[in-house]
């Protein structure tokens, strides 16, 4: 299933620890686009390999 995404709602402005929140409309869930140097579902881990 291909899902388009929106900006996250205000309810999830702090969802991603080091990145940008995107809301997957079809799945009805947030996702994170991590800033450089961070990994994890919520960009919670520093990428030690970066």
């Amino acid at each position: 299933v291909v899902s388009h995404f929106n900006d996250c709602p205000d309810s999830h402005t702090q969802f991603c620890f080091h990145g940008t929140c995107r809301f997957l409309v079809q799945e009805d869930k947030p996702a994170c686009v991590c800033a450089s140097g961070y990994v994890g579902a919520r960009c919670e881990h520093a990428d030690l390999l970066a």
Epitope: N6, A41, R42
Partner: antibody
């Protein structure tokens, strides 16, 4: 994905109670957990939420002094603590994850 | 916090008929509205998210629409198992809020 809530509680006015909600099939750190109240013959009321990853909470204004939400990521469990109970707190309390996944509800009866 | 005004609070309709429930938000909620069916003794069941997206397993006779502050939820070809209370939920704001609920009865 499943949310298993603790059993029914009968409590005295003025007392406190702590309800639990244990998740299986997902990690509660992946998103927020919510609690909802339904009094007999009344509608659904959103109590608040917790981000289990860091403990941050948000409460609806009317529950600010009544409810405390906590989480234990090691047991994948969220908790709702209700204080200074009155007859107005007699209700079913539901936990939820995202919008689709709900526990079966816990009935709290406040009675002398 | 955002108020959700849901109407009507109750309605009665015939089997095979169609009903529409509305929710009006006190401010723009950017289509972040969900609709639930709730039956006694059970947890609420999500039918629609993000205004019009049907949850898996929900029949297409259920539908949702709207934008800005105004949203609606419709059931066509009513069946006996549709008897329940239906709620809207806005999840745009930091503090979620439910509508007051609509109790659906069959004539």
């Amino acid at each position: 994905v499943q949310l298993q809530q603790s059993g029914a509680e009968l409590v005295r006015p003025g007392a406190s109670v702590k309800l639990s909600c244990t998740a299986s099939g997902f990690n509660i750190k992946d998103d927020y957990m919510y609690w909802v109240k339904q009094r007999p013959e009344q509608g659904l009321e959103w109590i608040g939420r917790i981000d289990p990853a860091n403990g941050n909470t948000k409460y609806a204004p009317k529950f600010q002094d009544k409810a405390t939400i906590t989480a234990d990521t090691s047991s994948n469990t969220a908790y709702l603590h209700l204080s200074s109970l009155t007859s107005e707190d007699t209700a079913v309390f539901y936990c939820a994850y995202r919008r689709a996944y709900w526990g079966q509800g816990t009935l709290v009866t406040v009675s002398a | 916090d955002i108020q959700m005004t849901q109407s009507p609070s109750s309605l009665s309709a015939s089997l095979g008929g169609k009903v529409t429930i509305t929710c009006k938000a006190s401010q723009d909620i950017n289509k972040y509205i969900a609709w639930y069916q709730h039956k006694p003794g059970k947890g609420p069941r999500l039918f629609i998210h993000y205004t019009s997206k049907l949850q898996p397993g929900i029949p297409s006779r259920f539908s949702g629409s709207g934008s800005g502050r105004d949203y609606s939820f419709s059931i066509s070809n009513l069946e006996p198992e549709d008897i329940a209370t239906y709620y809207c939920l806005q999840y745009d704001n930091l503090l979620y809020t439910f509508g007051g609920g609509t109790k659906l009865e069959i004539k």
